[in-house]
Amino acid sequence: ASGSASGSASTLVHNGTSARATTTPASKSTPFSIPSHHSDTPTTLASHSTKTDASSTHHSSVPPLTSSNHSTSPQLSTGVSFFFLSFHISNLQFNSSLEDPSTDYYQELQRDISEMFLQIYKQGGFLGLSNIKFRPG
Amino acid sequence: SVVVQLTLAFREGTINVHDVETQFNQYKTEAASRYNLTISDVSVSDVPFPFSAQSHHHHHH
């Protein structure tokens, strides 16, 4: 078989206090960094970012939660609880662009969902969300 | 419609499955007005540690 798989975006959103600006390599700014692509759902958790201007992305600084394989890294073996959440958005239509983190539709929906979760779980214990995946309802 | 699946991370001991689901359900009305997202069929479950992101998603389809 040809080709290499790529991961659905694993974005850690976090209400961080210190922030830094970074320049994105692509001319069109993307509100979420596109992950290193080598599995269907990589466990790398990146920082939440919001669009600022045409060439930069604003990131909240977060604790490093990364893993080089399909299991969570050892430093997370205690102190963190994970929950799988699934829900339907009935007023949106799925289309194939929701399978690709570089599309506008994917990025807009992911940004809205990420912001929504920051609003819902404002208490101190919330670390973020990751492994977001969209599929038809 | 669009089905959204994701993993939430919390500091251990700060929340349980029931509270994750309750808080999310309580926000559904605001989500509709603020983000124009009409949310339904919410399902929350514990992810056993350590977990595989891939098998975890697969088991919940």
Epitope: G3, H37, S96, E99, D100, P101, D104, R135 | -
Partner: antibody
Framework: EVQLVQSGAEVKKPGASVKVSCKAS????????INWVRQRPGQGLEWIGY????????EYNEKFKGRVTLTSDTSASTAYMELSSLRSEDTAVYYC??????????WGQGTLVTVSS | DIQLTQSPSSLSASVGDRVTITCRAS??????LNWLQQEPGGAIKRLIY???SLDSGVPKRFSGSRSGSDYTLTISSLQPEDFATYYC?????????FGGGTKVEIK
Amino acid sequence: EVQLVQSGAEVKKPGASVKVSCKASGYTFTSYGINWVRQRPGQGLEWIGYIYLGSDYTEYNEKFKGRVTLTSDTSASTAYMELSSLRSEDTAVYYCARSAGSLFAYWGQGTLVTVSS
Amino acid sequence: DIQLTQSPSSLSASVGDRVTITCRASQDIGITLNWLQQEPGGAIKRLIYATSSLDSGVPKRFSGSRSGSDYTLTISSLQPEDFATYYCLQYASSPYTFGGGTKVEIK
């Protein structure tokens, strides 16, 4: 390693139908999309349509609407592309390409469909 | 439909040469462009996704970039196995469309 294995070459008469299969192996992950693309002899690539495995969600290129049907069998991790009312200009190699976190990540080896009377 | 104008349609080069292939999009497609390699036998492999991200297992001599509506695939030092046909593919909007292809031949 992910593999997409397509069915073998077909020879069909004008007016007939052909059904090409695309079986995914390597990952048991069953939620992803499959795009179908064709390449006529000596020509470039042309997008036919898309199906999300395990659902009835499809997208079609207007050019093929009404003649092409995309289906899938989740239990067999297989996608199918059926093209009806075949004509000589449908002679082409038909490719499937699956998503894996992004579109067109893996490609099948291609299936040659020859339409000849 | 979005048109992708790919140039050149063919080129002759030697091993070690730097090769540049360009695709121009008729509409704004952001970074939603892939580069594909088709071997002489017909096998297709994705090299670059999202304009500039290298697929795993693809040699680092391949790179992708963008300037406005122009998208470029660069092979920094051509190797014998790189003699093939290259296509760009946009997935910004349906129907997804391909460039006309660039055949890279041995000089």
